[in-house]
Amino acid sequence: TLNSVLNSNAIKNLPPPLGGAAGHPGSAVSAAPGILYPGGNKYQTIDNYQPYPCAEDEECGTDEYCASPTRGGDAGVQICLACRKRRKRCMRHAMCCPGNYCKNGICVSSDQNHFRGEIEETITESFGNDHSTLDGYSRRTTLSSKMYHTKGQEGSVCLRSSDCASGLCCARHFWSKICKPVLKEGQVCTKHRRKGSHGLEIFQRCYCGEGLSCRIQKDHHQASNSSRLHTCQRH
């Protein structure tokens, strides 16, 4: 939820592009802002989906996980698969779409009693102020009921991406949310990790634009986990 200090800035109410990779939580002190993507996405399609080989979940887009494409298939041949939506079967949290987690073999909506932190690969920092409330996020992707509300331009105040004009998303800037540009091909994005964190992100970037996924740069595959660069790339 917006008011949660921890992972509070889910970009609300935006159908993601094909293959739906979005950016993820940024760092409180990182030079490159990060972003967080909302809960289970009902718009994702896998038409013309280009398989992307992987070895771990972190190499896949936000709305993907790394696994063998066939049941009981060769574990050595793994690709990025579309995340599992609510009420779908799962074996681990990473299989479930953002805003959900794996409970008793089923993807269920994240709730207040289950902590789902996500951290960026760069630095995060805990802030000991009176707002440091632990809270999760659960986001819908329904269209806004108020379609006639003037769409915000870059920098405008917003609560969800439908408050912003085309090509912009609603993303956090410090402690509030403003309309920011959707990322273009080649721009740096932040890969999420489905791990706990007491870090506090202050900045968000938007997710990658249509037809793009946030993936590790090929020439950075050998880099250490903490410094791998992710950019918006064509599927």
């Epitope: 939820t1 009921s145 105040v157 969800r160 800037h173 402690w175 309309c179």
Partner: antibody, heavy 117, light 107 residues
Framework: EVQLLQSAAEVKRPGESLRISCKTS????????MHWVRQMPGKELEWMGG????????SYNQKFKGHVTISVDKSSSTAYLQWSSLKASDAAMYYC??????????WGQGTLVTVSS | DTVLTQSPASLAVSPGQRATITCITS??????MNWYQQKPGQPPKLLIS???TLRPGVPARFSSSGSGTDFTLTINPVEANDTANYYC?????????FGQGTKLEIK
């Protein structure tokens, strides 16, 4: 300590202009959106609009758009609510409120605007 | 706009009893509901923010529940200084909208 100090009460005539202020302290002004909320006598609260000082980006409630202007002066960490031509129906208590991740957590003490001919 | 229907408009509760205020929204707003207390001559005070999160310094007597369209603020037990108007506020989509308010009176 976060503080939002609003300007004193105003008594105006219809058609006159007015600018009320909200001077902030105790936090980094450019890091939080500032909202303006109206409360007519004995009535509920109404969100008028907000401004993010970072780029000066605003968003208005359609009900108030075009009738009021929200602005900021970053150098003095102050937010403003302005009317170019007041109406009798603008008589109300006006609050500035700081945004904290969607909620309005700190509020000014309010500025009472009286519009009477 | 998301319309918030708050009820009851007023209620009177004896000290030590439970007070319950409800807020129903015209659209699904997840858990993006906030609750405020406003005493005469004062600005609203944030009691509970999104995700049913009790704000620092607010007594645990105040609690809230709900998500989607149905929300409840509970004060249990009520104390004499809880006399005030209470408002719900949705922060899910612009424009922000408030409930009409509930006047709580302590018998």
């Amino acid at each position: 300590e976060v503080q939002l100090l609003q300007s004193a009460a105003e008594v105006k005539r219809p058609g006159e202009s007015l600018r009320i202020s909200c001077k902030t302290s105790g936090y980094s002004f450019t890091e939080n959106t500032m909202h303006w909320v109206r409360q007519m006598p004995g009535k509920e609260l109404e969100w008028m609009g907000g401004i993010n000082p970072h780029k000066g980006g605003t968003s208005y409630n359609q009900k108030f758009k075009g009738h009021v202007t929200i602005s900021v002066d970053k150098s003095s960490s102050t937010a403003y609510l302005q009317w170019s031509s007041l109406k009798a129906s603008d008589a109300a208590m006006y609050y500035c409120a700081r945004d904290w991740l969607g909620a309005m957590d700190y509020w000014g003490q309010g500025t009472l605007v009286t519009v009477s001919s | 706009d998301t319309v918030l229907t708050q009820s009851p408009a007023s209620l009177a509760v004896s000290p030590g009893q439970r007070a319950t205020i409800t807020c129903i929204t015209s659209t699904d707003i997840d858990d993006d509901m906030n609750w405020y207390q406003q005493k005469p001559g004062q600005p609203p005070k944030l009691l509970i923010s999104e995700g049913n999160t009790l704000r620092p310094g607010v007594p645990a007597r105040f609690s809230s529940s709900g998500s989607g369209t149905d929300f409840t603020l509970t004060i249990n037990p009520v104390e004499a200084n809880d006399t005030a108007n209470y408002y719900c506020l949705q922060s899910d989509n612009l424009p922000y909208t408030f409930g009409q308010g509930t006047k709580l009176e302590i018998k």
